[in-house]
């Protein structure tokens, strides 16, 4: 094949090599950029900055090598458009530092920075940590800071991410109230801070105020939906990012719903209860307090992390006619109480039939493992003339 006269030449099916001395000062308009998986750049003394726009359109890029060139600065968001990048070789350039943000969000298997005049500072604490933890092949490079010795020996006692304290109201918050949250940020070299409010949706009207080092957030006219929702304060410095999440408890009275009994492996009277604080529950059977036992008891489903409502069952193991009747669920918290009732009829009296004269009912064997916590049944022959589903 004839030698390639261009600044950059194809290499394999999806690679590009740019090695002609001084031919590039940016990476705009590389040929076939959208399909590139590998880009090799060498001897480009005029290529001094790598920024967001340089790698736009290189969404398939896996390997990027820029060596023996003039690279002085890599923007924190330079690789935003190359999320698949797994190997990054920036050796033998003029880099004094590289922000932690540059590699955040990437899954780098390899990061090569040897041969750069790195300047030891807290901004490279993340790289020192990579070296300590054996990440990205960094330890093998024995990185040095220009005139300062090994990166591994850099003092790091003062290199911490920001410290955040979020103040929430001590007093009870009611529906319709306005709530002021304050986030105090401490630390060296603070760069940015803010609130993450993605979970709030229609839970309140949001107004932000203030700036570093004290950020205010007013949640106006809060609803009960605000419960279990994270309000997050974040801050960044040259070392890294810190986040603290809080939740605001909005008090509201207990409520309860009951549904018709259903037969599963066992019988279940489904219920839903809501309220903040979480209500205490009590069952009545035909107007009298129901004492829970291993035959009749309250069973909760796994709660959703972001809501206060709890779903569950009054579970009845093999109920008989004595369990037929009126079931009432009482729910109460300091802000109110509620109740709901339902009639349940599980069966007629099964003990009045003559066992000498059974009604034959045939069931298929069940040999699978039991997931219900009930014994695994082999077969069910019911002499009481009451057909039952076998779970």
């Amino acid at each position: 094949a004839a030698p390639c006269p261009d600044a950059c030449c194809p290499h394999g099916s999806s690679g590009l090599r740019c090695t002609r001395d001084g031919a590039l000062d940016s990476l705009h308009h590389l040929p076939g950029a959208e399909n590139l998986t590998e880009l090799y750049i060498e001897n480009q003394q005029h290529l001094q900055h790598l920024e967001l726009r340089d790698l736009r359109g290189l969404g398939e890029l896996r390997n990027l090598t820029i060596v023996k060139s003039g690279l002085r600065f890599v923007a924190p968001d330079a690789f935003h458009f190359t999320p698949r990048l797994s190997r990054l070789n920036l050796s033998f350039n003029a880099l004094e530092s590289l922000s932690w943000k540059t590699v955040q969000g990437l899954s780098l298997q390899e990061l090569v920075l040897s041969g750069n005049p790195l300047h030891c500072s807290c901004a490279l604490r993340w790289l020192q940590r990579w070296e300590e933890e054996g990440l990205g092949g960094v330890p093998e490079q024995k990185l040095q800071c220009h005139g300062q010795g090994p990166l591994a020996h850099m003092p790091n006692a003062s290199c911490g991410v920001p410290t955040l304290k979020v103040q929430v109201p001590n007093a009870s918050v009611d529906v319709g109230d306005d709530v002021l949250l304050r986030c105090q940020v401490e630390g060296r070299g603070l760069e940015q801070a803010g609130w993450i409010l993605t979970e709030l949706e229609q839970s309140a009207t949001v107004m932000k105020s203030g700036g570093l080092p004290s950020l205010g957030l007013t949640l106006a006219n809060v609803t009960s939906d605000l419960n279990r929702k994270n309000v997050t304060c974040w801050a960044e410095n040259d070392v890294g990012r810190a986040e603290v999440s809080v939740q605001v408890n909005v008090s509201f009275p207990a409520s309860v719903q009951l549904h018709t009994a259903v037969e599963m492996h066992h019988w279940c009277i489904p219920f839903s209860v809501d309220g903040q604080p979480a209500p205490s529950l009590r069952w009545l059977f035909n107007g009298s307090v129901l004492n829970e036992t291993s035959f009749i008891f309250t069973e909760f489903l796994e709660p959703a992390a972001n809501e206060t409502v709890r779903h569950g069952c009054l579970r009845l193991n093999q109920p008989t006619h004595v369990n037929n009747g009126n079931y009432t669920l009482l729910a109460a918290n300091p802000f109110g109480q509620a109740s709901a009732s339902i009639m349940a009829a599980f069966m007629d009296n099964p003990f009045e039939f003559n066992p000498e004269d059974p009604i034959p009912v045939s069931f298929s064997p069940v040999d699978t493992n039991s997931t219900s916590g009930d014994p695994v049944e082999k077969k069910d022959e019911t002499p009481f003339g009451v057909s039952v589903a076998v779970g």
């Epitope: 004492n291 829970e292 036992t293 291993s294 193991n317 093999q318 008989t320 004595v322 916590g373 009930d374």
Partner: antibody
Framework: EVQLQESGPGLVKPSGTLSLTCAVS?????????WTWVRQPPGKGLEWIGE???????NYNPSLKSRVTISVDKSKNQFSLKLSSVTAADTAVYYC????????WGQGTLVTVSS | SSELTQDPAVSVALGQTVRITCQGA??????ASWYQQKPGQAPVLVIY???KRPSGIPDRFSGSSSGNTASLTITGAQAEDEADYYC???????????FGGGTKLTVL
């Protein structure tokens, strides 16, 4: 498969407290099951002692209620029995089991009350 | 009263059918469960609830109930069925459990 294993001292002095633990393996003590203690004096029948649910509900045999405490430790996946003011009549093999049907049992541990 | 009464001993010829009974007021309200216990071993559940049989229990074991009496029937008794059999149910109050005194089954 659920397995239960009782452990505790085999000899308790009269008027002392009998303490046993039942370790549950092959399943979570926080499942939708209750856990129970049953005892059997030598050469005699079975006697139900009491039961507990992981949320703290418990029920005891009325004849033993004043002396019995059953507790659960979810972090260790185990539950325990304490029987106070024991006498020779409390000498028995003590079993733990899964309620309500007692479909899984421990192998039992003999506790002798003697000075 | 919170009692379940069983015959202390019952015998059966090999291959024949035997019925072990359990009497008590609570059996008008609640199901009996049945346990087999061999010397030096923990009891084993054989019947529970509405004549339900756990996995691994032969179908020669069945349960029934009428009035205040629950019965465990072994149809075609085998030598390995020789054991003590205990019934259990909820007490009439429903708040605790009671066992019968046990029946020693001998297979001849």
């Amino acid at each position: 498969e659920v397995q239960l294993q009782e452990s505790g001292p085999g000899l308790v002095k009269p008027s002392g407290t009998l303490s046993l633990t039942c370790a549950v393996s092959g399943g979570s003590i926080s499942s939708s099951n209750w856990w129970t203690w049953v005892r059997q004096p030598p050469g005699k029948g079975l006697e139900w002692i009491g039961e507990i649910y992981h949320r703290g509900n418990r029920n005891y045999n009325p004849s033993l209620k004043s002396r019995v405490t059953i507790s659960v430790d979810k972090s260790k996946n185990q539950f325990s029995l304490k029987l106070s003011s024991v006498t020779a009549a409390d000498t028995a093999v003590y079993y733990c089991a899964r309620a309500p049907w007692f479909d899984y049992w421990g192998q039992g541990t003999l506790v002798t009350v003697s000075s | 009263s919170s009692e379940l009464t069983q015959d202390p001993a019952v015998s059966v010829a090999l291959g024949q059918t035997v019925r072990i009974t359990c009497q008590g007021a609570s059996l008008r309200s609640y199901y009996a469960s049945w346990y087999q216990q061999k010397p030096g071993q923990a009891p084993v559940l054989v019947i529970y609830g509405k004549n339900k049989r756990p996995s691994g229990i032969p179908d020669r074991f069945s349960g029934s109930s009428s009035g205040n009496t629950a019965s465990l029937t072994i149809t075609g008794a085998q030598a390995e069925d020789e054991a003590d059999y205990y019934c259990a149910s909820q007490a009439s109050s429903g708040n605790h459990l009671i066992f019968g005194g046990g029946t020693k089954l001998t297979v001849l």
